[in-house]
Amino acid sequence: AKLGAVYTEGGFVEGVNKKLGLLGDSVDIFKGIPFAAPTKALENPQPHPGWQGTLKAKNFKKRCLQATITQDSTYGDEDCLYLNIWVPQGRKQVSRDLPVMIWIYGGAFLMGSGHGANFLNNYLYDGEEIATRGNVIVVTFNYRVGPLGFLSTGDANLPGNYGLRDQHMAIAWVKRNIAAFGGDPNNITLFGESAGGASVSLQTLSPYNKGLIRRAISQSGVALSPWVIQKNPLFWAKKVAEKVGCPVGDAARMAQCLKVTDPRALTLAYKVPLAGLEYPMLHYVGFVPVIDGDFIPADPINLYANAADIDYIAGTNNMDGHIFASIDMPAINKGNKKVTEEDFYKLVSEFTITKGLRGAKTTFDVYTESWAQDPSQENKKKTVVDFETDVLFLVPTEIALAQHRANAKSAKTYAYLFSHPSRMPVYPKWVGADHADDIQYVFGKPFATPTGYRPQDRTVSKAMIAYWTNFAKTGDPNMGDSAVPTHWEPYTTENSGYLEITKKMGSSSMKRSLRTNFLRYWTLTYLALPTVTDQEATPVPPTGDSEATPVPPTGDSETAPVPPTGDSGAPPVPPTGDSGAPPVPPTGDSGAPPVPPTGDSGAPPVPPTGDSGAPPVPPTGDSGAPPVPPTGDSGAPPVPPTGDAGPPPVPPTGDSGAPPVPPTGDSGAPPVTPTGDSETAPVPPTGDSGAPPVPPTGDSEAAPVPPTDDSKEAQMPAVIRF
């Protein structure tokens, strides 16, 4: 069976029907359907006016405008808000009421596209394998990134979050139109990785998506990750304004000037250093979501009541921090270079700025405890990786899971750890699953490009597709049309259960209390340390253009360079065309399948590190499980990122006069705001009033936006406000 042309709100669209084998199965593929009008710089997306005739949806459209890996030119286009759909078809009747899975790509909110890197005409985010193996509809789409997607003045002049609103427009388009493609508009699952995983998380928390999302999967990124929320957007807006010659004294004039500046100039005005960094790489990621008082009405830690009815899977890779650690400390991947105590202490101190000397020392002591018994370079390098994995991914994900569980009504919660080792031949043998290593398996690359993979890789891919698509169908990864290798138990605050995903899975794959000692350290011990408010706690950023080095790889393999293997410290420069040959991915997640390691398995899967493979010691107390992390604004552990040393600004609530009007925007219904019950909902950050966070006010032109403290504008905001 095949769909032929489909009538959407924009008009008729015609895709391609691709036959699969001799049994009559096929997949209908639609590429490049507009879900919003061509964008205007630094403006919210608008509905597409539609078209006449039949749109031939047969080719991917250009990605949204972004810098090339060398950061000296741009590619992509301002007209970029398009989506792609894969619909599996049986032999006889066209599909009806299929679950829908919407992918949100990663790339540090700075780069990426809905189709991903291309290798042998197979795109990383090609939905065919998931769709046909799992019998689900797969949707991918583009959203604005970098300054064009996330530049904000921290007030109503430029509220920011344009890229998040693009994502919402795509989700809402799917809700309204997917029935015509054979999808069930009441069974939409979001899934995404890295910044895409965080975006999934943020979309579930935004009141604008009330009633749109049934389930969600966050891979290596949640709303609470320390690189997700920009607490000092004006600092970064001014940096760009200065570069393009806009006035910075008055926010309104600056905003008007930025809106009429050549979008390419805006894009190139922001450069991320990759080599010779003075501070950890994540300090330099400036254009990310903000708490705008509308789309994201309050600190994400206080919005989990909005996701109370959404089934949720979240997890990380066991060495998610490896690629970042290897940029921050290049010795990690070099057998002839050593990591010293001094190196690690410096790194730790840069991540713990807001807690001053005590924060650095206690953190250093906790992480180097094993060094006395095992002073080997391998152990020390693993420690650095574990540290960055914990801070950037694992701890925030654990907190997000606990928050979801604590607020959930009917919704289920599941946790996983992906440990199938990286296949990058240039990496040391001890490296586990690096950041973005999971993507290739979720998207079925071992089946789509089999020559680059081994049978064990296909086993992992089959299992992940089965779990992911079963979950999309039923809300339970064990139940659906696909057989799974072992039962995945839900996460609860009592058991902290998680599934370890490896090539050999059985009953022992279900584990408990991942790295509990470190989770408890960050959420209890570290949190209790006094915050240093001294201005010296915030590092000064490099200001020159000398650091115009490649963008750090953060999830979209198509733009991620191979980690350096020589002594130069600089990665090779890949091609820069929009559709040319992709750079070699750092993590085997895409394009060129990496050279298989010699031997049967390559590096063995690394057990959850830091606890010597032994089950972590449960915390003291009655429950035998880690406590649910503090939920008030003052108690968001490694979560709230990139603020000044002081507390984050709070959206105006209650004291600013009359309460805002409930939303009239795209939400579809009044937003859910956290309830006041501290047992299940985080304490709202509203000072003394005790009132819940402000709901969105509909039109972001007039949205309340939290004030930003600009008194330290000359300084670089710390990326983590631990």
Epitope: Y7, G10, Q52, G53, G668
Partner: antibody, heavy 119, light 105 residues
Framework: QVQLVQSGAEVKKPGASVKVSCKAS????????MHWVRQAPGQGLEWMGV????????SYTQKFKGRVTMTRDTSTSTVYMELSSLRSEDTAVYYC????????????WGQGTLVTVSS | DIQMTQSPSSLSASVGDRVTITCRAS?????LNWYQQKPGKAPKLLIY???KLPSGVPSRFSGSGSGTDFTLTISSLQPEDFATYYC????????FGQGTKLEIK
Amino acid sequence: QVQLVQSGAEVKKPGASVKVSCKASGYTFTSYNMHWVRQAPGQGLEWMGVINPGDGYTSYTQKFKGRVTMTRDTSTSTVYMELSSLRSEDTAVYYCARDYYGSSPLGYWGQGTLVTVSS
Amino acid sequence: DIQMTQSPSSLSASVGDRVTITCRASQSISYLNWYQQKPGKAPKLLIYAASKLPSGVPSRFSGSGSGTDFTLTISSLQPEDFATYYCQQRSSSPTFGQGTKLEIK
């Protein structure tokens, strides 16, 4: 100027079929989608489906799938709507309407055709 | 399908009055159109894309709203404005509101 002229009133028995025509003039016939909307006596408007006169692609609302067929004749710039297995509740005025621009507003309407289904 | 609910179902007003009709969608929609229909006549497009006026429509008609809540306003009623008004949403299966009958008081 844009004109949509529909065929005359029809009286049909239950179980029969009716075919209503809509002749377009004043614009390029194949460039705009044509919709069919019906209105039962004293009731509101109900969208039935749409045809692209350029390639003949159609889309029908779930309620009418299997009973309605929309076709076009480019040589005469005419679209047709055939409704089968008529029942008394199909008694209504049937309108053809052309897109105004883009894909949404129905900017130009025919005068309507009354179809009465009665035994 | 997306349900469209208009309010009020009917209303009486006098020439010169300012009149407001609302339309609420059961979920967020991208575009909303308004039509005017007089007895025995075909509907006429009044406003499209929530707030845009087709050529020939008097400026006393205006529309606003986004997401789920929309409004049609007639700033100063004229005798020829007494009619039934329908809202319509655009999706893969367009639907109309049940109509609002505007009568002379």
